[in-house]
């Protein structure tokens, strides 16, 4: 169930994450799947395990194979498999399909190209970018953190983009390259009157006095990039920032794009240490865009502390 493909080039660093998650404090054991032989954790080895990460510094073609990781949590062990393939370096410029990471699409409004897998590495700027093997030069190209920004994107900007960076491990430097295709698409989105998915209109949320409570305002606005779209919470018709109660804060969720292409936003209202007076407030989830504003109202009610759910759940 938990198998992940990873690939790299010989003589470059490759770092692979266990496909099963866990907390940093949980032990992760790595094995060569074929032999069940444990992978060492000592950093003096060329291939070694470091918690959730398996490091090839540098990788060799012979390292190709399946690796097993077992996350040992306080409850159950969880197993993942990393299917690693190390390829010989190509002499020509063409990057074969099997070395390509997922294609990204950009448009005039959004032209970020993220460098794949870079978050696994200990890298420092500068991050170098190449298109079809040519180093990118000119003011239209800006390497920012772990991504490339292209200004005024045109259809000619489509192509294969390679990022190159240096991974540092205990003072030793290793090169890493990663390539992905970039396509340019016309913005063909549309905008709708906001649709609030949560909370339901006039929902009553049960809370416990003295405990923390979360309310999520979730709404969709159409397809594609939205020019103006926002979700927010109001208390008794007042913006959270103006209400002046530090226990009650709103926190922006991630922009969400669902499989049906809808552009949706979340805003979480966090109420710390719920008090009696919080039950008297009216909580409004507002979703607005160029078409207008939609409002769903929520009220809080006290959860009976001797309720069965409170005891066992």
């Amino acid at each position: 169930k938990f198998s992940k493909q990873s690939w790299g080039l010989e003589n470059e660093a490759l770092i692979v994450r266990c496909p099963r998650q866990g907390k940093p404090s949980y032990t992760v054991d790595w094995y060569y799947s074929q032999t069940n032989k444990s992978i060492p954790t000592q950093e003096r080895n060329r291939v070694f395990a470091s918690g959730q990460l398996l490091k090839f510094l540098p990788a060799e073609v012979a390292d190709s194979g399946i690796y097993t990781c077992i996350v040992r949590s306080p409850t159950f062990n969880r197993t993942g498999y990393a299917n690693v393939t190390i390829y010989k370096k190509q002499s020509d410029c063409n990057v074969p399909d099997y070395l390509m990471y997922s294609t990204v699409s950009g448009s005039e409004k959004n032209s970020k190209i993220y460098c794949p897998t870079i978050d696994l590495y200990n890298w420092t700027a500068p991050l170098e970018w190449f298109k079809n093997c040519q180093a990118l030069q000119g003011s239209r190209y800006r390497a920012h953190k772990s991504f490339l920004v292209i200004d005024n994107v045109m259809t000619e900007d489509a192509g294969d983009y390679t990022c190159k960076f240096i991974h540092n491990e205990n003072g030793a430097n290793y090169s890493v390259t990663a390539t992905r295709s970039f396509t340019v698409k016309d913005e063909q989105g549309f905008s709708l009157f906001p649709v609030i998915g949560a909370p339901a209109q006039n929902e009553i949320k049960e809370v416990e006095i003295g405990k923390n409570a979360n309310l999520t305002c979730s709404a969709c606005f159409g397809k594609g990039t939205q020019f103006l779209a926002a979700v927010l919470w109001q208390l008794n018709g007042t913006k959270i920032t103006d209400f002046g109660e530090p226990r009650i804060q709103q926190e922006e969720g991630q922009n969400q794009s669902f499989s049906n292409g809808l552009a949706c936003l979340d805003m979480v209202l966090r109420i710390a240490d719920v008090k009696e007076e919080d039950l008297l407030l009216q909580y409004d989830c507002l979703a607005l865009n160029l078409h207008g504003l939609r409002r769903h109202t929520v009220r809080l009610s006290r959860k009976n502390p001797i309720d069965h759910h409170s005891i066992y759940c």
């Epitope: 306080p74 409850t75 159950f76 969880r78 197993t79």
Partner: antibody, heavy 121, light 107 residues
Framework: EVQLVQSGAEVKKPGESLKISCKGS????????IGWVRQMPGKGLEWMGI????????RFSPSFQGQVTISADKSITTAYLQWSSLKASDTAMYYC??????????????WGQGTTVTVSS | DIQMTQSPSSLSASVGDRVTITCQAS??????LNWYQQKPGKAPKLLIY???NLETGVPSRFSGSGSGTDFTFTISSLQPEDIATYYC?????????FGGGTKVEIK
Amino acid sequence: EVQLVQSGAEVKKPGESLKISCKGSGYSFTNYWIGWVRQMPGKGLEWMGIIYPGNSDTRFSPSFQGQVTISADKSITTAYLQWSSLKASDTAMYYCARHGTSSDYYGLDVWGQGTTVTVSS
Amino acid sequence: DIQMTQSPSSLSASVGDRVTITCQASQDISNYLNWYQQKPGKAPKLLIYDASNLETGVPSRFSGSGSGTDFTFTISSLQPEDIATYYCQQDDNFPLTFGGGTKVEIK
């Protein structure tokens, strides 16, 4: 087909003993944890505990520790939940559920059909 | 014990609506969270494991997200057969604990 088949409904009096069963088939019974979940009438799910039939290792929720016994007979691929002295508050639906192997786990992926236990004088 | 707080406790939505259920853990549980569907008179059924992985055979309209303490379960387009109670469950620590459940009804 992987399945867990539970014993039939029981009607008992307070103070009586009871042992309900859960028979596993279609998979390696000794390699998977089997657990029990209680659902009182009109209420939610409560995890009671688990057993690893391969070595009879058990884990209990503190709420059920000492109240029930969980056992297994690997020769007949069956897990058991038993009470030595039933109370009216034990009236509930009891489900057995498979909890993954000693090396891998991804939720309670196979459930029995449930056994209704009614305790009434 | 880790407390799992699920909300709302019940909701009513129309066929085709997007339905969202939230689950909050009283402490960090990484992504060790599962979602179950229980139809009236039936045993629960695993839908999502490890917060976001769809169990084999489960329709793609069901999805899950989140990590740490805050988790979301979504039905992208509610169908009549989705009438059920949905439970979240953590398995980061013993005892395993369930949320109080969310009863989903059709308007």
